[in-house]
Amino acid sequence: FGISGRHSITVTTVASAGNIGEDGILSCTFEPDIKLSDIVIQWLKEGVLGLVHEFKEGKDELSEQDEMFRGRTAVFADQVIVGNASLRLKNVQLTDAGTYKCYIITSKGKGNANLEYKTGAFSMPEVNVDYNASSETLRCEAPRWFPQPTVVWASQVDQGANFSEVSNTSFELNSENVTMKVVSVLYNVTINNTYSCMIENDIAKATGDIKVTESEIKRRSHLQLLNSKA
């Protein structure tokens, strides 16, 4: 490429989290080059003997790819020319967590940036009125979480109240023996109030809200990844 080795280019990554069993993205951008054939992208993982992914001369070069990533990686080939070196990681595994390096060579020079990739399981909670219960009860369910999260109930009317004494949370291992179903029940619920079920681990924070009035029930859910700028 005629690179002197003295020039460095700017490479930018974003810390992110992957939901195990689903596809994930490891984000990386760089100063673009006018010729695709002059761009080399290498994705490395700390402590791994082979490459995560290599893209050079306009195509994937996977002869030295580590077996743990075989068949699971892809770059967005049509976006490389505009400086997108992001990696798509299929079927995220718990063991994919770690420090990754996005290493770029272009005709302008070379550069790299590390990113921290966390893996776990996180899902939206759904809060429902439990009509089977003897008293007014809410049931908050989320199908997949890992590591085991904390569950906290809150209420709009009784702000700052501690509901731990009037709630019960259980964790049920899912069939793949890693993720767990989260079920939390809140007792002694009053009408005309909005209750929030907040589920959180070190990867994600999710909230399920339910507003119960005499005439209607309104629900809303929200999920936020932690320690991630994405």
């Epitope: 490395l44 402590g47 030295e64």
Partner: antibody, heavy 122, light 107 residues
Amino acid sequence: EVQLLESGGGLVQPGGSLRLSCAASGFTFSSYAMSWVRQAPGKGLEWVSAISGGGGSTYYADSVKGRFTISRDNSKNTLYLQMNSLRAEDTAVYYCARDIQWYGESTLFDYWGQGTLVTVSS
Amino acid sequence: DIQMTQSPSSLSASVGDRVTITCRASQSTRSWLAWYQQKPGKAPKLLIYKASSLEGGVPSRFSGSGSGTDFTLTISSLQPEDFATYYCQQYGSYSRTFGQGTKVEIK
């Protein structure tokens, strides 16, 4: 100071099992792949097995595949080698060595333990 | 697996001599080659990595060259403490194959 200390070697009968341990200190253990290397008496070095920093990938020499299992406990900074169906030709000094941190960028086998002797004999 | 062949298997030399050991890989290993020195009863010591990079603390009389399949370790002026066995090792694949070793003895 980086230190690697192997233990668990000894005399075992053919067909028997043994578990070697390697206690690591002085570096961020989970950031490095680790390897086991052996040396039969009076012979050369033979790479046996390696494991990635997070433990998600394991690698074996053909001579031990299916009989040996490498593992690590990053919370204890310890590397293991479970050796089953041992044969006379497995007799050797077994060394643990620090492997790479980054593919293509870093040194490897820059630190070694003192070795532990495994003797397979009836 | 990539096979590594070292030559010679042993050599006799005098203090001050220039010594060259060669290592050939059965297939390309790019520049992923290391050289080690081992003395009797001791663990091996890393001398060279990435074919030509000198490990910290190793005397500059040791040098490495080559890429692909052919590699060389050179000791420019042999010292008394250099009498030992030297091993090459490839790490261009998941396995880490060693050469059979070259024993450097006093003439």
